[in-house]
């Protein structure tokens, strides 16, 4: 019969014929022959492959260094990469997630429109009219001014995306 | 080997601009953020703010915020820090820097003097 | 803005002898998450700044361990055990906990 020039899923084509790839979590340590199927050898401790392969040697996995902010997040297995996050405080610089950056803190007249994540950083938000923030921090949102009215008070100074509003006492009218 | 190397010394006008430039190499580009730091004639020195390569999410010192933007080319691996409406004081050696666990390697630094 | 005051701004020593620095932050560096976010630098003559001490009291990479860091939320020590010629420069702290970011005005060592 003619040797094949392609073969099915889950194979590779070695020597004019069709060997079986090594599961994930498995590396090749001989390919097959007419008589033999291919041989593969689970990874060791802190390696995997993550794919149907033929590859002679396991990947490292991911060394989440703690010098550099990170953690892990999810232990890798024979068939997965470790994770890593950074710690409390800061994110990700990237997916690869080699590095670590600082949380960003909103500036008094910006709020936090959404909190940072061990991979997003915080974002803010400018306070409209009707609300402030007097403050720079990574978890505040604007506030809105203080009603006066509701209070019986009268609005004695303004109110800034800065600053809330001062109430003072209405002024009586006098008999 | 890590590397990071800046432009050349500047003699600028006050209240025009100037661009400096920091080309990486021997890592990731877009795997760590990128600092400016300036040092003026005899003083210390003073965080201008950084870029994220992977994100292009700058963060500015407020003191520099409508003056000074800082952008990256992923393609060249280089990081760009330009002031603007530049004056006397501006007169300094500006640094790029890479934050790993620290700033753990920095630019030659640029001078840049402002001068009529 | 975190404010770091360093002393003494100017530090005269005999190699040989030990020295000391210290830096203040008008506000604790010490996160929640439980790592202190001071920093140490050196820069000598002509040249840029570099590493000695991050988080407070890990020796970087290549610094040599006479170089040591302590302290407190507020309050640093930076030592040498016994200075050298080649530690001459100005030596400053710097704090991570929020931005902006700001350095110490830093400390010259010289030799006596």
């Known amino acids: 019969p003619e040797p094949p020039t392609a073969c099915r899923e889950k194979q590779y084509l070695i020597n004019s014929q069709c060997c079986s790839l090594c599961q994930p979590g498995q590396k090749l340590v001989s390919d097959c022959t007419e008589f033999t199927e291919t041989e593969c050898l689970p990874c060791g401790e802190s390696e995997f492959l993550d794919t149907w392969n033929r590859e002679t040697h396991c990947h490292q996995h991911k060394y989440c260094d703690p010098n550099l902010g990170l953690r892990v997040q999810q232990k890798g297995t024979s068939e997965t990469d470790t994770i890593c996050t950074c710690e409390e405080g800061w994110h990700c610089t990237s997916e690869a997630c080699e590095s670590c950056v600082l949380h960003r803190s909103c500036s008094p007249g910006f709020g936090v429109k959404q909190i940072a994540t061990g991979v997003s950083d915080t974002i803010c938000e400018p306070c409209p009219v009707g609300f402030f923030s007097n403050v720079s921090s990574a978890f505040e949102k604007c506030h809105p001014w203080t009603s006066c009215e509701t209070k019986d008070l009268v609005v004695q100074q303004a109110g800034t995306n800065k600053t809330d509003v001062v109430c003072g006492p209405q002024d009586r009218l006098r008999a | 080997e890590v590397q990071l190397v800046q432009s050349g010394a500047e003699v600028k006008k006050p209240g025009s601009s100037v661009k400096v430039s920091c080309k990486a190499s021997?890592?990731?580009?877009?795997?760590?953020?990128m600092h400016w730091v300036r040092q003026a004639p005899g003083q210390g020195l003073e965080w201008m703010g950084y870029?994220?390569?992977?994100?292009?999410?700058?963060n500015y010192n407020q003191k520099f915020k409508d003056r000074v933007t800082i952008t990256a080319d992923k393609s060249t691996s280089t990081a760009y820090m330009e002031l603007s409406s530049l004056r006397s004081e501006d007169t300094a050696v500006y640094y790029c820097?890479?934050?790993?666990?620290?700033?753990?390697?920095w630019g030659q630094g640029t001078t840049v003097t402002v001068s009529s | 803005d975190i404010v770091m005051t360093q002393s003494p701004l100017s530090l005269p020593v005999t190699p040989g002898e030990p020295a000391s620095i210290s830096c203040r932050s008008s506000k604790s560096l010490l996160h929640s998450n439980g790592n202190t976010y001071l920093y140490w630098y050196l820069q000598k003559p002509g040249q840029s700044p570099q590493l000695l001490i991050y988080?407070?009291?890990t020796l970087a990479s290549g610094v040599p361990d006479r170089f040591s860091g302590s302290g407190s939320g507020t309050d640093f020590t930076l030592k040498i055990s016994r200075v050298e010629a080649e530690d001459v420069g100005v030596y400053y702290c710097m704090q991570h906990l929020e931005y902006p970011l700001t350095f110490g005005q830093g400390t010259k060592l010289e030799i006596k």
């Open positions: 870029i994220n390569p992977s994100s292009d999410y700058p």
């Open positions: 820097a890479r934050w790993g666990y620290s700033f753990d390697y």
């Open positions: 988080r407070m009291s």
């Open positions: 021997g890592y990731t580009f877009t795997s760590y953020t």
